[in-house]
Amino acid sequence: MAVTACQGLGFVVSLIGIAGIIAATCMDQWSTQDLYNNPVTAVFNYQGLWRSCVRESSGFTECRGYDSLLALPQDLQAARALMIVGIVLGAIGLLVSIFALKCIRIGSMEDSAKANMTLTSGIMFIVSGLCAIAGVSVFANMLVTNFWMSTANMYTGMGGMVQTVQTRYTFGAALFVGWVAGGLTLIGGVMMCIACRGLAPEETNYKAVSYHASGHSVAYKPGGFKASTGFGSNTKNKKIYDGGARTEDEVQSYPSKHDYV
């Protein structure tokens, strides 16, 4: 039962994580204009992996896709690639894990097959989570670098009479969504790997040991030696399938006011 719960929970956590990775990848707010000395702005800029947007205080928002792939910063391209790889691996992992779920009966699938599938999906979730975390971190690092470069430019260019407003960008909501989602996917993957250990088939090996006593010979056959990879020393016989199938509850024109003030 604990194995089924661990596997089921791992699946749900990974599912939420992958949904989060997809959401983060699609979100436009990867970087948002830093309102360092101007908490109320009439023009607010924010950027995603795929397009940049400008929201005017009048409520009108205009988004524009990036024109050239080659002209984009390498870090942005790396973040895109890592997020896509994370989504693809996560999606495959979800597909594999559905069939690996202990509560789902598929023909006469062996426990060993389910254990292998659980392990495979777990590893996929772990890699998927790491890809998402890496993608978000690469982008965040690019932002930090650009932020300090912009700050340096801001203070070196203040000698003239006419001030040019230097737009600095800081972490957007998508980064935090990505980090949390990547972490959840990673945790889900670890849980699947743990569940896999409990799903491995119980081999009962009878090893006969002969004891030669004086006068007569008695052969003792001790109780079955448990070859389970589970954590507990549970010696009860397990059913191949859990009782009933467990069901898990799975838990954006008019202009609009700017929400960045």
Partner: antibody
Framework: QVQLQQPGAELVRPGASVKLSCKAS????????INWVKQRPGQGLEWIGN????????NYNQKFKDKATLTVDKSSSTAYMQLSSPTSEDSAVYYC???????????WGQGTTLTVSS | DIVMTQSPSSLTVTAGEKVTMSCKSS????????????LTWYQQKPGQPPKLLIY???TRESGVPDRFTGSGSGTDFTLTISSVQAEDLAVYYC?????????FGSGTKLEIK
């Protein structure tokens, strides 16, 4: 069509607060910012502040922060600007306007001429 | 606050002439996010409220005759009337729409001979 209706004139005694109105029609009132602009006789334009009718969020020009208070009544699609302790300096034409693309003001009321006199 | 400076303060022309008026801002009005200049031009005829002519420095509002053209970027902007008509007699104001508080220029008064 879009209209912003303002009373033509208001007379107020110095020190007695006054509430100017701006009734909007012909569009979804709660979806566009309402701005207030001051114009003294023979002078230029000054932006006082704006209000978002949907949630009454306001921005003020610091110069008018203690002078003007912007409010809205969504049920009657009317925006208000209350001027506290008016003096002769507050005698001017006050326009209400609607925000448009580029943060520009596409529709303007006819303006209320406020006279502060004893 | 961004200071808007308009020049000349007034100009007198004959009908059919080409007119240009200038507007300078103390800070750049160019937004890097969409490469648009947040400058607006208004026309105010005597006894009337201002009327929107041009926003984003060069985008003509619908219904505005095409003889009105806005140009410029950053801190220097120009409003050009290619062939002045008698009905163009008005005061023309430029406005900063880039940062709060929104500020207006002192205006350029156009008079017809």
């Amino acid at each position: 069509q879009v209209q912003l209706q303002q009373p033509g004139a208001e007379l107020v005694r110095p020190g007695a607060s006054v509430k100017l109105s701006c009734k909007a029609s012909g569009y979804t009132f709660t979806s566009y910012w309402i701005n207030w602009v001051k114009q003294r006789p023979g002078q230029g334009l000054e932006w006082i502040g704006n209000i978002y009718p949907s949630d009454s969020y306001t921005n003020y020009n610091q110069k008018f922060k203690d002078k003007a208070t912007l409010t809205v009544d969504k049920s009657s699609s009317t925006a208000y600007m209350q001027l506290s302790s008016p003096t002769s300096e507050d005698s001017a034409v006050y326009y209400c306007t609607r925000s448009w693309r580029g943060n520009s003001f596409d529709y303007w009321g006819q303006g209320t001429t406020l006279t502060v006199s004893s | 606050d961004i200071v808007m400076t308009q020049s000349p303060s007034s100009l007198t022309v004959t009908a059919g002439e080409k007119v240009t008026m200038s507007c300078k801002s103390s800070q750049s009005l160019l937004n890097s996010g969409n490469q648009k200049n947040y400058l607006t031009w208004y026309q105010q005829k005597p006894g009337q409220p201002p009327k929107l002519l041009i926003y984003w420095a060069s985008t003509r509002e619908s219904g505005v005759p095409d003889r009105f053209t806005g140009s410029g970027s950053g801190t220097d902007f120009t409003l050009t009337i290619s062939s002045v008509q008698a009905e163009d007699l008005a005061v023309y104001y430029c406005q900063n729409d880039y940062s709060y508080p929104f500020t207006f220029g002192s205006g350029t008064k156009l008079e017809i001979k």
